[in-house]
């Protein structure tokens, strides 16, 4: 069964900067990745970025830079403007879509005890969807 992993880390050099890393473990090619915060895509989450493997990326504030790391993983840099966007308490979700086979989504957040720069992966919450 395909799986999605999500890892959130605070940058050691800038405490207001966070990076979300997401990856897809499974066969097949990815046609679109959606990153949201505050909940899963389609369930009240707010979209931060969408990435297409050929056509590029789109992002919305407070997302700063979305990019592909490999053919099956992405990263999204975020700029925390302060109290208005408390990333440390926020859930980030990544959905990997493979049209028309299906889509797979998982969520994660910054580990509560994590020090800046450490990137201990949280326990992912898989949200599986069969389209």
């Amino acid at each position: 069964t395909p799986e999605v992993w999500v890892q959130v880390q605070m940058e050691a050099t800038e405490l207001s900067s966070f990076t979300v890393h997401c990856g897809f473990l499974g066969p097949g090619s990815i046609s679109l990745v959606t990153v949201s915060w505050g909940g899963p895509d389609g369930a009240g989450g707010t979209k931060l970025a969408v990435l297409h493997p050929e056509l590029g990326t789109r992002q919305w504030a407070p997302a700063r830079q979305a990019r592909w790391e490999t053919q099956s993983s992405i990263s999204l840099a975020l700029e925390d403007s302060g109290a208005s966007s408390p990333f440390a308490n926020t859930t980030f979700c990544c959905k990997f879509a493979s049209f028309p086979e299906g889509s797979w989504e998982s969520c994660g957040s910054l580990p509560p005890s994590s020090d800046p720069g450490l990137s201990a992966p949280p326990t992912p919450v898989p949200i599986l969807r069969a389209d």
């Epitope: 046609s31 679109l32 959606t34 895509d41 389609g42 369930a43 009240g44 707010t46 979209k47 969408v50 297409h52 056509l55 590029g56 789109r58 919305w60 959905k95 879509a97 049209f99 028309p100 889509s103 389209d131």
Partner: nanobody
């Protein structure tokens, strides 16, 4: 969660017509487009038609003048009127919501189970 349910597929003779419907429900915030894709047996999927958030319909060249896409916002529904059907239109048709990266393509983010259209005499 976004749910898209297609209906209206079936068997039709060449030159005939069909109207596909898609009932949409759920949260579709920050999507740019809604449309129809199709996948013929043994072939790659292709975007057939979509409507931008500004209401402009766009079509792949092979269906221009034959297919018409429309929306009913009150019913949260999308339609595809298919006229002058050809054997090469035989495919599973999927209703999709997605994002625009260029003018002509609606990248699917959510889609339905699909409805089969068979054009044969």
């Amino acid at each position: 969660e976004v749910q898209l349910v297609e209906s209206g597929g079936g068997l039709v003779q060449p030159g005939g017509s069909l109207r596909l419907s898609c009932a949409a429900s759920g949260y579709t915030s920050r999507t740019d487009c809604m449309g129809w894709f199709r996948q013929a047996p043994g072939k790659e999927h292709e975007g057939v038609a979509h409507i931008d958030s500004d209401g402009i319909p766009r079509y792949v060249d092979s269906v221009k003048g034959r297919f018409t896409i429309s929306q009913d916002h009150a019913k949260n529904s999308l339609y595809l009127q298919m006229n002058s059907l050809r054997a090469e239109d035989t495919a599973v048709y999927y209703c999709v919501v997605g994002f625009k990266f260029d003018e002509d393509y609606c990248a699917p983010n959510d889609w339905g189970q699909g409805t089969m259209v068979t054009v044969s005499s």
